[in-house]
């Protein structure tokens, strides 16, 4: 899966929540960021994530589509210079400081099985998705397309009216 351009085709800020409306939050602890899945209090501000969308070509042996065989890759950045990374060895999702060009571990294939929710498939480990496990984000193996609808890998993106990226 090769990214077809070095620049994203679009970027926007959104807050990320689970299918059950828990918020994904990011906290700086001991000079590293921790990722939490939690219920926010009524007026608590949601953390925002910069989503950058990139076009990507299917590997030629995987699709008969030719130029038509495009998909969307996303990177997710909750704060400047930090991106979500897939740690496939530990089956974990981590926030790491990176410089561009970003490593493959920072790219996720975008899926939406429902019109109002999305899933993020690891670029470096096809069939493995960001999911929720024990109030944390983790990498979860999905063995068939039917299981793409399992709620623990579905996330909602809600628009934000703030245009800063803290």
């Amino acid at each position: 899966m090769s990214i077809t351009g070095i620049s994203p085709i679009t970027e926007y800020l959104a807050s990320l929540s689970t299918y059950n409306d828990q918020s994904i939050t990011f906290a700086l602890e001991d000079e590293s960021y921790e990722i939490y899945v939690e219920d926010l209090k009524k007026d608590e501000k949601k953390d925002k994530v910069l989503l950058s969308y990139y076009e990507s070509q299917h590997p030629s042996n995987e699709s008969g589509d030719g130029v038509d065989g495009k998909m969307l890759m996303v990177t997710l950045s909750p704060t400047k210079d930090f991106w979500l990374h897939a740690n496939n060895k530990e089956h974990s999702v981590e926030l790491h400081k990176s410089e561009k060009p970003l490593p493959d571990q920072a790219f996720f294939v975008l899926h939406n099985m429902h019109s109002n929710s999305v899933s993020f498939e690891s670029k470096t480990d096809p069939g493995v998705f960001i999911g929720v496990k024990d109030n944390h984000l983790a990498l979860i193996k999905v063995d068939s397309s039917e299981n793409l609808s399992t709620e623990n890998i579905l996330f909602k993106l809600s628009e934000t009216h703030h245009h800063h990226h803290h």
């Epitope: 699709s63 008969g64 038509d68 495009k70 969307l72 099985m113 019109s115």
Partner: antibody, heavy 121, light 106 residues
Framework: EVQLVETGGGLVQPGRSLKLSCVAS????????MYWIRQAPGMGLEWVSS????????YYLDSVKGRFTISRNNAENTVYLQMNSLRSEDTATYYC??????????????WGQGTLVTVSS | DIQMTQSPSVLSASVGDRVTLSCKAS??????LDWYQQKVGEAPKLLIY???NLQTGIPSRFSGSGSGTDYTLTISSLQPEDVATYFC????????FGQGTKVEIK
């Protein structure tokens, strides 16, 4: 080369049923959301229905909910629109379209030539 | 539901003119906006996706811009073959077309 060929249109009386088919070729059908969009004579475009890659999730325009059913057969590269209880206001050219990207419901990357449905007594 | 409003309904311009078509959404659509061109007797075709990305094979005189609720399609130098109706379309929440802008040559 991507091709979408719609069939099944025609003249039908109000209250009757019609089933539209769209046969796809030139791309990996099971990777893409598929759609039906319609256009009444001399009017604009109106999204009618969507179905995700595996057919597990379907969406409809409010005015056709309960009357129209979208489905797909990935083995046969075909998407269907079953239209029941047809009304005169359903008269339109019905277009089949495919998603622009694999796996996502963003953009209509390619359209068929359409099939005309006329509902009249 | 998100409503999409296009203006003007009809635009008449001369060959070579720079023309601008407008599309306004009832809510923020996060740049999830396309433009489609439909010539008389033909199926629509995708011109621009995600606000400002030109579909393969579309001439570079077409460009898109915008954010939030306000979006624009610009034809930098109108050509006779650009006579068509242009529809904006949002997919941020559900799927909705604008009512179209018909572009004519004076």
């Amino acid at each position: 080369e991507v091709q979408l060929v719609e069939t099944g249109g025609g003249l039908v009386q109000p209250g009757r049923s019609l089933k539209l088919s769209c046969v796809a070729s030139g791309f990996t059908f099971s990777n893409y959301w598929m759609y039906w969009i319609r256009q009444a004579p001399g009017m604009g475009l109106e999204w009618v229905s969507s179905i995700n890659n595996d057919g597990g999730n379907t969406y409809y325009l409010d005015s056709v909910k309960g009357r129209f059913t979208i489905s797909r057969n990935n083995a046969e590269n075909t998407v269907y629109l079953q239209m029941n209880s047809l009304r005169s206001e359903d008269t339109a050219t019905y277009y089949c379209a495919k998603g622009h990207y694999s796996y996502t419901s963003y953009s209509f990357g390619y359209w068929g030539q359409g099939t005309l449905v006329t509902v009249s007594s | 539901d998100i409503q999409m409003t296009q203006s003007p309904s009809v635009l008449s311009a001369s060959v070579g003119d720079r023309v601008t078509l407008s599309c306004k959404a009832s809510h923020n659509i996060n740049k999830h906006l396309d433009w489609y061109q439909q010539k008389v007797g033909e199926a629509p075709k995708l011109l621009i996706y995600f606000t400002n990305n030109l579909q393969t094979g579309i001439p570079s005189r077409f460009s898109g811009s915008g954010s939030g609720t306000d979006y624009t399609l610009t034809i930098s130098s109108l050509q006779p073959e650009d006579v068509a109706t242009y529809f904006c379309f949002q997919y941020n929440s559900g799927w909705t077309f604008g009512q179209g802008t018909k572009v004519e040559i004076k």
